[in-house]
Structure formats: structure tokens, C-alpha cells
Amino acid sequence: EPPTACREKQYLINSQCCSLCQPGQKLVSDCTEFTETECLPCGESEFLDTWNRETHCHQHKYCDPNLGLRVQQKGTSETDTICTCEEGWHCTSEACESCVLHRSCSPGFGVKQIATGVSDTICEPCPVGFFSNVSSAFEKCHPWTSCETKDLVVQQAGTNKTDVVCGPQDRLR
């Protein structure tokens, strides 16, 4: 009686259960009554990540340097390549098919979270008592200078974009 279902890591063909090819190998010929399944290793820059009956291996993803991409983890015969972005850039999607330059935080805003290869810079407005006078992808908001600790007084108030200006205390006549 020919089988209607096969064991794990097998497939049904011509009323017969044949072994699947292991990850990293592709199918060359199905098994017969007298021969085992014939499999061949994937070639250079190719992979198959499951037990399979594929006759062609998949090409590794190409991390195109012209799109700002580089290889984060090289593919093997069983795994695909993982791409990431060059420093200063981040992926435009989860698949990381291209990169864009990290955003800078404008004056009045500081970096809340520095960008990574997969996420952009997160900026936050400088709260009262803090300032940022540069456009930067790294700088946080800096606290205003404390004039009092220097035995000085505030001559000009600070803003979210400028530090306070300290000056000498008025001498009592």
C-alpha cells in the first residue's frame, strides 16, 4: 500500500517517501525504489535555511555599498546575509534595503537617543534650565551655567538655545 503521508524531513513523490535535503543543500534528484534522494551543497553566496526539496538555492542578499549598506553578518550556506548601514546612517526599513543619514537635532533640541544602524536619532526639546546651541546627532541638552557657584550673577538669562551670561555682582556703595 503506497503511503499517503510521510515522516518529518521527508516528502511524498511518486507514491514514495523521500528524504528532504538538509539546510545548505539543494535537490538534484528524487529518491527511487532503489536510490536515496540526491542533494548538493549550495554554491558560493547561496543558501537554503530549511529542510527542503528546492532545486535552486537562494542568492544571499547583497549589501550594496552604493546604498550605504555593509555586511553586518555574512551569510552561510544555511543563512542569509544580514545588512546594516555604514556609521552615520540607518536603515530605511526593517529589511534594511537602503540607508539614510542620521537626523541631527536642531539648536534648542538635544539628543534623547543616539541613532543606531536601524533607528534614527530621537530629539527632545531642551527644558527650562538646559540649552543646545548646535545642530548635532550626538549632543544632549546642556545645563545652564550656575553663576552662583562662581560667585557671579546672571547678566543675561539663558534660553533653550543659549547659555546664561554671568557677570560680577554689583558692589554696594
Epitope: 558560493e44 555586511v71 553586518q72 555574512k74 550556506s77 544580514i82 556609521e87
Partner: antibody, heavy 113, light 109 residues
Amino acid sequence: QSVEESGGRLVTPGTPLTLTCTVSGFSLSSYAMSWVRQAPGKGLEYIGVMNTGGSAHYATWAKGRFTISKTSTTVDLKITSPTTADTATYFCARGYIGSPNLWGPGTLVTVSS
Amino acid sequence: AVLTQTPSPVSAAVGGTVSISCQSSKSVYYNNYLSWFQQKPGQPPKQLIYLASTLASGVPSRFKGSGSGTEFTLTISDVQCADAATYYCAGGYTDSDDAFGGGTEVVVK
């Protein structure tokens, strides 16, 4: 950004030795790290690589003779049972062979009885 | 994988051009995962070229890498005395079967 090897010294044959590659200015979750060695007066020899995901791959000749592992800022190369043939300067390099690299100055291992 | 380089040493005259070949026993990763390194005695290797033809930062444009798949060439034009060194090709492959060539010594006359 820099990489620096340490731990090289004189050891007797069969005494395990661990070399450390310390990185600064970049993350090991973003870059693979390769190990290469060079015997005195000889050519460069690829040992293996630590992938960003934490898996290590070895040159065929190096399997069983070396173990590569990592922490958040270091990548270690353990010479499991050194022989005199393992006397060499050991280098770690950021990235895969063939791609852009950043190399350390190397650390010298001498195996002698 | 095995990388076979031009037999060593290779002689070059100051101001002249020298080419070093590197043949791989199989295609390198992406067909371009090949680097060229320069090494002088007592120094670590210095990367000149990566991804077969991209010039590393700070390397003079006199150094040029070419080739794809299994055949690669490093060409040094307008050779200088400072170019006297040993040059290595290095290939990256799937499953990290990476390798270095045996090295080619360049002697400048």
C-alpha cells in the same frame, strides 16, 4: 575607534592560553571580529571570526585548536593546547576578511618548553 | 579556499609599474570580497584595497585593485622606495572559509 590585542606571553606546550581583543569606539553587535596570526618570518594565516550574532566560525585547520568567544567589549581567542607551531603574532581585526578592516598591533605568543 | 599569488619576489624600478596577481580556488563572497594588504617588517598589515577595488582611507591612488570572482590584480604605478614591502591578498567566502595568499615581496630598485 581602535582594537588592541593582549595576553600574549611565553607558555609551555599544552598549557591553554587566552588572548583578548579589546575594542573601543564601536559595538561588537555591529561588527564581526576576525583573528589572524603570523609565525615569525612567515605569511598571514586566517584563524576564524566571531559574528555579530555570537556564533564563531573557524578555518578548517583551526577547528578544535582554537575557541573564539566574546563579551560586550572584548573578543577572546583561546589556544586550547598550544604546540611550538603556534608560536606567532596574533592579530584581531574588525570586520570580515575582504571588507574594510581595522587591525590591532598584535600580541606575541611564544610556545616553548 | 586557496589563494595563489604571483611568485615572490617581484622587482620594480622607482617610477615604474608593478602588478601582482591573486587567483582564488573558488569565487569569493559577492564576487568582490577580496582585500590587498601591505606589510613591512615589524608592523601589522595595512589594508590598501577592500571589496576588490575600493581604496582604503589614506592610501595613495597609485594603488589600484581590479578583478572579480576568482582573478584579482593589485597594480602599483609610479613605484616609490616606500612601496618596498610584502603584499598579501585575502579573500572572504561563504561559511567563513576565508584565506590569505602566500604573500609577494616587492623589491624596489
